[in-house]
Every structure is written in C-alpha cells, then in structure tokens.
C-alpha cells in the first residue's frame, strides 16, 4: 500500500546502557479513526465526526504493524521478522534497547472498510540512541516502585534531572491510556494503591530550527509492600522423619515462604549431613510456585534415584535464607516396616 498519505511522527528513544528498559509505540491513528479503533479517547455520542472514516472491527488487536527497510525494500511484517518486538493491541513493545531499533514503523488497520481507510495509517520515525551525557548521573530509573499506602511519585526518566520550572509540558500514558490531567515531569500519588501499578509512558516535544520530535521514555511501575522483617519459613517438610521404601526412588520437596524484599536474593538449598560432614547437593533449579504482593513461595526438590541403607544413616537438610536470616529443616529417612 502507498504510505505517502500516512501521518508522520518522529520519536526519540534515548536508552541507558546501565539498565534494561523497554519502549513502546502507539498506533496513533488520526483522531476520528483512532476513536473508533483503538478505544483510546472514545468519542461520546455528542462528538460524532462529520464522517466515520474507519468503521472497522472494535477488536483492539486489529492493526497491522510494518517496518520500512532503509534500503527501499517492501514493508516487512513486524511479527514475522522481529522476535524482540511484540504487538499488544494497538501498541508495539520493544523488549530490548539498541540502535538497531531505529527505523520507520507503520501501523494501519487490518480491515479496510471504506475509501477513507486507505490513508488511515501512521508512520513513526524512531531514532534510538544510547544515553551519552553523564551530566545527570541520578536520572530516574525505568523501573520504579511505589510503596502501598504511602505517598509516592513517578518520574519521567528523560526529564528527572530538570526542575519542575524548567520542564517542558509532558504527556503521560498509563497502560496505553492518556492521563490528561498530568502535564509535569513527575506524577505525584497521594496514596498508593495496587491499581497504580503498570506501564507508564512520558512524552515531551523537543525542537530545533529544522524540525520537532517526541522524546519518549517508558517506566515500569510496581506497587510494593515494605520489606519483610522476617527470615523465610519452611512450609514443607514439616516432619523431621520420613518413611521410605528401600530400593525405590524418592523426591523430597522443600517449600519455603519468603517475605517481600525490594532487592530479593532468596537462597534455597539442600545439604546432606553425613555424621559430622555436610555438603551441598546438586539438585534441580528452584521454582516459584506462588507469588503475591507480600510473599513468594519457592520450591526445590532433592531426588534420590534409589533409597539405600546408606541414606538411612544421614540427614537431608533444607536451608533457606534471605537478607534477614536463615532457617533449616532436616529430614531423617526411616525404613517403612511391613
């Protein structure tokens, strides 16, 4: 299709080489089409446009994204060629930063249902650069935490070093929806609730004598509870003896509950205590089996291919640790009688 009629938008993504960050492009179709399509800024019944150019499906995923190769080759379907770019409804998510993401991205409806729809497309020219200026060493992170029940703020990473007075007008989005009341480089939250969690995007316009472009940053905000003051507790095994059948395989599971910690480095290991020696056992990786706001339950198994008499002469010890302290639970195997 002819992309010369597409509306054009220029965006700049300046990424930090120190941290992992994501980026998004919204399918910003011209206002009337967008309102019928991507369910953003929906028109009220009184705001009917003179014509309804795109009367396509209301399915939010019915847009098609392409990349325009710089060598003039035909447009490429994003989904087929770029595994690090994911389409979610009308939004394109870039999972990894890098200058190789620079280029022109085009979005348009999948279903063309009226003559007006032919020009219903947006071309976004994305420039991606690594952050070079070290003038702002403490720029806000692309991952920010808000403590539930307290006051907090979300800062726009690309503007966090500027004072509110210097800051240009900022457009904020949360999970793809425009936050029309927010215009400063910082969103202040009077009381944090779990619904404040999400993907926030902050945009502001930068210009030079030739052109203007949108500088965009993406912030992943999570709502958290305060760090635990407790060491982890072992939920299983509960008993310190376990009846087993000799010659049979055996799996002993260790399940431990770890309270929330902002910097979370849980340890869960199995040791064998053989008389007065102890050594760590090579066992399958630990896995998280339940995660809530307040805590996480992690499980790690020890597998014996065949229980022998030797195993009845030693203890199997599960050791768990967080930044507060550690807990152990030992299991003594006992032969099943009869």
């Amino acid at each position: 299709f002819n992309i010369s009629g597409c509306s054009t938008k220029k965006l700049l993504w300046t990424y930090s080489t120190r941290s992992e960050e994501e980026f998004v492009l919204f399918c910003d179709l011209p206002e009337p089409q967008k309102s019928h399509f991507c369910h953003r800024n929906r028109l009220s019944p009184k705001q009917v446009p003179e014509h309804l150019p795109f009367m396509g499906s209301n399915d939010l995923s019915d847009v098609q994204w392409y990349q325009q190769p710089s060598n003039g080759d035909p447009l490429e379907d994003i989904r087929k060629s770029y595994p690090h770019i994911i389409q979610d409804k009308c939004t394109l998510h870039f999972l990894t930063p890098g200058v190789n993401n620079s280029g022109s991205y085009i979005c348009r409806p999948k279903m063309i249902k009226s003559p007006y729809d032919v020009a219903c497309c947006v071309k976004m020219i994305l420039e991606v650069k690594p952050q070079t200026n070290a003038s702002c060493e403490y720029s806000a992170s692309h991952k920010q935490d808000l403590l539930l029940g307290s006051t907090g703020s979300i800062s726009c990473p690309s503007l966090s070093c500027q004072s509110d007075a210097q800051s240009p007008a900022v457009t904020w989005y949360k999970n793809g929806k425009l936050l029309s009341v927010e215009r400063s480089n910082r969103i202040v939250v009077d009381e944090v609730y779990d619904y404040h969690q999400g993907t926030y995007v902050c945009d502001y316009t930068q210009s030079d004598t030739v052109s203007s472009w949108t500088v965009r940053a993406v912030v992943q905000v999570r709502t958290i509870v305060g760090d635990t003051k407790l060491k982890p507790d072992i939920l299983d095994p509960v008993e310190d003896t376990l009846e087993v059948e000799l010659g049979k395989p055996l799996t002993i599971s260790c399940k431990a509950r770890f309270g929330f910690e902002r910097v979370f480095n849980p340890v869960i290991k199995w040791y064998i205590k053989d008389s007065d020696l102890e050594w760590e056992v090579s066992v399958p990786e630990a896995k998280s089996i339940k995660s809530t706001l307040k805590d996480e339950i992690i499980e790690r198994n020890i597998i014996l291919e065949k229980v022998t008499q030797r195993d009845l002469r030693r203890k199997f010890v599960c050791f768990v640790q967080n930044s507060i302290g550690n807990t152990t639970q030992s299991v003594q195997l006992k032969e099943k009688r009869g």
């Epitope: 008389s275 007065d276 020696l277 050594w279 022998t308 008499q309 009845l312 002469r313 003594q332």
Partner: antibody, heavy 111, light 113 residues
Framework: SLEESGGDLVKPGASLTLTCTAS?????????MCWVRQAPGKGLELIAC???????TWYASWAKGRFTISKTSSTTVTLQMTSLTAADTATYFC??????WGPGTLVTVSS | AQVLTQTPSPVSAAVGGTVSISCQSS????????LSWYQQKAGQPPKLLIY???TLASGVPSRFKGSGSGTQFTLTISDVQCDDAATYYC?????????????FGGGTEVVVK
C-alpha cells in the same frame, strides 16, 4: 572430644567391653559413631558403627557375632568383644566419623 | 566385601617435591565421590584431610589435593614438607547393602627425604 576406656591385657577366650565417652557434644544431632582398630604396625580396620539417631548398626562381616556396638547414653558408646584371640591385639579407636577420633585404648590378648 | 587397594608402601618424596598416592576401589563408591583421605602419624589417631574425593577439610593446607571418582582416586601432596611424613589411608563409603558400608585402604607410608 572422645575418650576410650576399658583397654586391658586379657587371656584368649576372654570378653572385654570398651567404652567411648563424648564430651562437648551429644549424639542427638545424628552421628556415625564407630570403633576402628589398628594392630601394631598394621593398617586401620573398621569394626562397627552405630548411627545415633536411630541406633542403626553396621558391622564388618568378620566382626559379626563376636562384637556388639551399643549406644548406652546420649554421650557414651560401648563395644563388647567376646572370644578374644591374639589376633584381636590392637589399639582400639573410637571415632565420630569423619573428623573426630579418640586417642585410642590398647587391648592385648595374651596367655 | 569392598576392597580398597592403595599404592604400595613406602613412597618417598623430596622436600619441595610432589607425591601422588592412588586408591582403587573394587566397586564404585557411593555417589561416585564419597571417598575420604586420612593422615596418621606414629602414636596418633588418624586426621581427616579430604572428603567427598576433593573437598579439603578445614585447617588442611591447600598443598593436599584429592581427585578422582567412581573407583579410582588420587591424593597429591605438592611442595612436600618434612611434617608430611606419615601413613595415608583412603576410606570409601558404600551403599551399606550386604555388609558394605565402609572400607579403609591398606595405607601408604610417605617417607620424606
């Protein structure tokens, strides 16, 4: 630490009981307490072990029948020996496998 | 019953040199690496040097190194000191089925020149 006692000079055919006393720890956390002997100028020979959690015993095949290992308290283990012969002359060590050994007690079987 | 065969005695080593002692088991030890090494000096009880084939016991100099798995094991002493003159024993752990729980090797005497 561990200390053996009961070593003596006895006649062939006699019986003898050796005692091993632990200090500074007890057996509750589970140890293999063993008796090991060493004839003069010879190597180490494991006789028997008892796992102190469940009193599970193990004997070297040659020691079955004449030797009996027992846990008599939370800090003592004994070795009863019967029908002693000159071949049983040795220093008998009590060991908490693997790190802790007593100094040994000498048993001499001679007429 | 399991048999552990050690390098014939005595083995001589020069101060500052390296000496290796081998220990061969008639069957694989438990968990392929449950073998320990002891040092015994005249008139003293044995002292644990290495366990799990290669793990140094606390307080033992790093000049002592254990290696091997299954049925074949080696104790290597590098930068040999006069104090290393002793008899060295390997102790194998087995599955405790049919009387086989532990076995000592016959011992290897190391003479330091």
């Amino acid at each position: 630490s561990l200390e053996e006692s009961g070593g003596d000079l006895v006649k062939p055919g006699a019986s003898l009981t050796l005692t091993c006393t632990a200090s500074g720890f007890d057996f509750s956390s589970g140890y293999d307490m063993c008796w090991v002997r060493q004839a003069p100028g010879k190597g180490l020979e494991l006789i028997a072990c008892i796992y102190t959690v469940n009193d599970n015993t193990w004997y070297a095949s040659w020691a079955k029948g004449r030797f009996t290992i027992s846990k008599t308290s939370s800090t003592t283990v004994t070795l009863q020996m019967t029908s002693l012969t000159a071949a049983d002359t040795a220093t008998y060590f009590c060991a908490r496998l693997y790190k802790l050994w007593g100094p040994g007690t000498l048993v001499t079987v001679s007429s | 019953a399991q048999v552990l065969t050690q390098t014939p005695s005595p083995v001589s080593a020069a101060v500052g040199g390296t000496v290796s002692i081998s220990c061969q088991s008639s069957q694989s030890v438990y968990g392929v690496n449950e073998l320990s090494w002891y040092q015994q000096k005249a008139g003293q009880p044995p002292k644990l040097l290495i366990y799990k084939a290669a793990t140094l016991a606390s307080g033992v100099p790093s000049r002592f190194k254990g290696s091997g798995s299954g049925t074949q094991f080696t104790l290597t002493i590098s930068d040999v000191q006069c104090d290393d003159a002793a008899t060295y024993y390997c102790l194998g752990n087995y599955d405790c089925e049919s009387d086989d729980c532990y076995a000592f090797g016959g011992g290897t005497e190391v003479v330091v020149k």
